[in-house]
């Protein structure tokens, strides 16, 4: 026997209390597949999050981060403060890269300069806090 709920399209839920009729998801909720017995509450992009895509009856909202922050985690579950190039984020805020390390992005950690001699090469261009060394022949 076919489950009557399987006839309920995305954007609705199958209402067990009303003879399995398909009821529309209320505002700010969605069901992305058919045959669902519930609707999911839409994600709200608040505070440091901003809305990248509005919620619809069939798909969740998508958030990104306000300027000065960047996304972390699946689906931008967290926003982390940007730093300048040549810095990394620590518990005490943005700190300059230590000598011998660099960061060419606004996120992530400072990484050691490339050791050219390991490849039998010499330094063509010195490294900075923002840039790796350039190795040459």
């Amino acid at each position: 026997l076919q489950d009557p709920c399987s006839n309920c399209p995305a954007g609705t839920f199958c209402d067990n209390n009303r003879n399995q009729i398909c009821s529309p998801c209320p505002p700010n909720s969605f069901s992305s597949a058919g045959g669902q017995r519930t609707c999911d509450i839409c994600r709200q992009c608040k505070g440091v999050f901003r809305t990248r895509k509005e919620c619809s009856s069939t798909s969740n909202a998508e958030c990104d981060c306000t300027p000065g922050f960047h996304c972390l985690g699946a689906g931008c579950s967290m926003c982390e403060q940007d730093c300048k190039q040549g810095q990394e984020l620590t518990k005490k805020g943005c700190k300059d890269c230590c000598f011998g390390t660099f960061n060419d992005q606004k996120r992530g950690i400072c990484r050691p300069w490339t050791n050219c001699s390991l490849d039998g090469k010499s330094v063509l261009v010195n490294g900075t806090k923002e840039r790796d060394v350039v190795c040459g022949p």
Epitope: P26, S29, T38, C39, D40, I41, R43, Q44
Partner: nanobody, 120 residues
């Protein structure tokens, strides 16, 4: 940590009304559907209803005697129960979930409950 606290229970006579309250601390109801369940002695937990975004969904037993509403400013959800019957005697629990309705859902958080007794 989210805490849900129910209040407003008590002993009333058949035909009377009661309004139960559910207050949230540690988090607002903003992003959650709020549901009510009840459990009578020796019986299984029963779904009462769910409120979300201006819409309410109810279980199949109460015949329009129960109404769920919400006061955003007070971060409180209410269960208005009219024309109470002895079979409404139970512990009433407030719960929250990211699903609507909560008829078939295990809530994310649930309160300790408030006792309602309907007796002549």
């Amino acid at each position: 940590q989210v805490q849900l606290v129910e209040s407003g229970g008590g002993t009333v006579q058949p035909g009377d009304s009661l309004r139960l309250s559910c207050a949230a601390s540690g988090r607002t109801f903003d992003n959650y559907a709020v549901g009510w369940f009840r459990q009578a002695p020796g019986k299984e937990r029963q779904y009462v209803g769910t409120y979300w975004s201006g819409y309410a969904h109810y279980g199949d037993f109460e015949n329009n005697r129960f109404t769920i509403s919400r006061d955003n400013a007070k971060n409180t959800v209410y269960l208005q129960m009219d024309n109470l019957k002895p079979e409404d005697t139970a512990v009433y629990y407030c719960a929250i979930s990211l699903k609507y309705p909560m008829a078939t859902v295990t809530p994310d958080y649930q309160g300790q409950g408030t006792q309602v007794t309907v007796s002549s």
